[in-house]
Interface confidence: low
């Protein structure tokens, strides 16, 4: 067969859908790979062809669009399952072609089973709510295009396994779920089940997302440097190892880039000749406040190194701070037999 621009397997679009539910999957060619949309392609005489490779098979097969009740169908650039079955799992390819042009891309589709509490191997989107921040809402995701606006679905919200009703701070409002005041105890998985009729049948769409309650911007502060501080002096003899931790607390800030760095005599460690290593570790609180620790290490410190200025810097969207470490050379203890004895007039 003639050459086709093959975009390969688009693993970035690892599509997961629930078993026994409708699924509509757009051909990724028009969303990510081509500069024109389906309507333009169609009016230019290009045809969209679908085929698939079953799980654990190498054979490419056409998709059977003649199943009872039109279980699988195609509409424009969308492949429809009404509903999915477990053995629909596989790699799907959409190919756009005419006699002179061909372009195709494959993508994995996984049909996933869920239990009665909506637990499944599905990768869940995360929605962040600010702690104690007033009313915030989440919206039932990815339900557009499944039914016309004239159809009024019923929506039921669940937290974990439990239907949300008479909760004191979580209120279902159709496609939205309102949190009157988000608390850490609101962390968890929330599921909306959308039920709608179509051609005498009833379909259910299940959408689960993870709510993570994070630090509120109203409580956010500039970075706080816990170490170095004024209480600790790093007193070393030449030849010893110098270890100085820089520990910085960052309030959670959406999309903020938290940075910690050391300067030695005003320069970045990479820009000076001494043998310095810096190791970083990061930990997070339950509200995603961040503690970063960068340990500056000089294996064998010299007396010159002990005269240098070591400053820890930190920056977030809330501001920039810096703190110098107190470093000094240890004064050697007197050797009794020589120095001290001399002091007593011994000869």
């Amino acid at each position: 067969s003639e050459r086709c621009d093959d975009w390969g397997l688009d693993t970035m679009r690892q599509i997961q859908v629930f078993e026994d539910e409708p699924a509509r999957i757009k051909c990724p060619l028009f969303e990510h790979f081509l500069k024109f949309n389906y309507s333009t392609a169609h009016s230019a005489g290009l045809t969209l062809i679908w085929y698939w490779t079953r799980q654990d098979r190498d054979l490419e097969e056409p998709i059977n669009f003649r199943l009872p009740e039109n279980r699988i169908s195609k509409e424009k650039d969308v492949l429809w399952f009404r509903p999915t079955l477990l053995n629909d799992t596989g790699n799907y390819t959409c190919m756009l072609r005419n006699t002179t042009y061909c372009s195709k891309v494959a993508f994995p589709l996984e049909v996933v089973q869920k239990d009665s509490c909506f637990n499944s191997p599905m990768k869940l989107p995360v929605h962040k709510l600010y702690i104690e921040y007033g009313i915030q809402r989440i919206t039932c995701p990815n339900v557009d295009g499944y039914f016309p606006s004239s159809v009024k679905p019923t929506i039921t919200w669940y937290m974990g396994c439990y239907k949300i009703q008479n909760f004191n701070n979580v209120i279902p409002e159709g496609m939205n779920l309102s949190f009157l005041i988000a608390l850490i105890s609101n962390n968890g998985n929330y599921t909306c089940v959308v039920t709608y009729p179509e051609n005498g049948r009833t379909f259910h769409l299940t959408r689960t997302l993870t709510v993570k309650v994070v630090g509120s911007p109203k409580n956010a502060v500039p970075p706080v440097i816990h170490s170095p501080n004024d209480h600790v002096v790093y007193e070393k003899e030449p030849g010893e190892e110098l270890l100085i931790p820089c520990t910085v607390y960052f309030s959670f800030l959406m999309d903020s880039r938290n940075e910690v760095w050391w300067t030695i005599d005003g320069k970045k460690p990479d820009d000076i000749t001494i043998d310095v290593t810096i190791n970083e570790s990061i930990s997070h609180s339950r509200t995603e406040d961040e503690t970063r620790t960068q340990i500056l290490s000089i294996k064998k410190v010299t007396s010159e190194d002990l005269k240098r200025s070591y400053v820890c810097h930190a920056r977030s969207a809330k501001g920039e701070v810096a703190k110098a470490a107190k470093v000094k050379q240890k004064v050697p203890a007197p050797r009794y037999t020589v120095e001290l004895a001399c002091g007593f007039g011994a000869t």
Epitope: I131, G160, Y162, F167, I184, H226, S285, R286, T293
Partner: antibody
Framework: QVQLLQSGAEVKKPGSSVKVSCKAS????????IDWVRQAPGQGLEWMGG????????NSAQNFQGRITITADKSTNTAYMELSSLRSEDTAVYYC????????????WGQGTMVTVFS | EIVLTQSPGTLSLSPGERATLSCRAS???????LAWFQQRPGQAPRLLIY???RRATGIPDRFSGSGSGTDFTLTISRLEPEDFAVYYC?????????FGGGTKVEIK
């Protein structure tokens, strides 16, 4: 003001089970975690496990797994801790404690239930 | 598991004196998730400090908490007669939740 009221003292034989209850009054029960902590005579505090009633899923310390069952009844605002295969070293005061709203620390404690295990 | 070591085991002080209690963790504790409790004889523990340094509701300001990483301190600026009790630190950032062995503050 939320209060946690625990069931009364128990005397048990080795090998038996004990079920201690913890009833919440005066506030929201189901969205906060209820944890269980025990204290042997003259000893420190030991976390056993907890439950968020709204989920019903429990989380317990490894040294109690297989012996502890933590449940909650949302209709009565009551959490339960059942410890099986009792031995003499399980003699302790058992406390329930509420995991706070924003602090997540144990901000409200029950009065404690003394469980004595001896033959 | 994070092991919390409290020191000293016993602190003998007089009313009006300053008490400094230490809690050292075997691994770094998320700085937001360390609490201090007071326990008087025959009573349930009472939350004093959470999130390292935040006073719980109704706790007088003579109690203060500080620290980060692995070293934490509870300070009672001026001991009142009712402050003589056992104090426990607790980390609640990672499972299993763990308590320190306690520091007894007794009257000298």
């Amino acid at each position: 003001q939320v209060q946690l009221l625990q069931s009364g003292a128990e005397v048990k034989k080795p090998g038996s089970s004990v079920k201690v209850s913890c009833k919440a009054s005066g506030g929201t029960f189901s969205i906060y975690a209820i944890d269980w902590v025990r204290q042997a005579p003259g000893q420190g505090l030991e976390w056993m496990g907890g439950i968020i009633p709204i989920f019903g899923t429990e989380n317990s310390a490894q040294n109690f797994q297989g012996r502890i069952t933590i449940t909650a009844d949302k209709s009565t605002n009551t959490a339960y801790m059942e410890l099986s295969s009792l031995r003499s070293e399980d003699t302790a005061v058992y406390y329930c404690a509420r995991n706070g709203a924003t602090s997540d620390a144990f901000d409200i404690w029950g009065q404690g239930t003394m469980v004595t295990v001896f033959s | 598991e994070i092991v919390l070591t409290q020191s000293p085991g016993t602190l003998s002080l007089s009313p009006g004196e300053r008490a400094t209690l230490s809690c050292r963790a075997s691994l770094s504790v998320s700085s937001n998730y360390l609490a201090w409790f007071q326990q008087r004889p025959g009573q349930a523990p009472r939350l004093l400090i959470y999130g390292v340094s935040r006073r719980a509701t109704g706790i007088p300001d003579r109690f203060s908490g500080s620290g980060s990483g692995t070293d934490f301190t509870l300070t009672i600026s001026r001991l009142e007669p009712e402050d003589f009790a056992v104090y426990y630190c607790q980390q609640y950032g990672s499972s299993p939740l763990t308590f320190g062995g306690g520091t007894k503050v007794e009257i000298k």
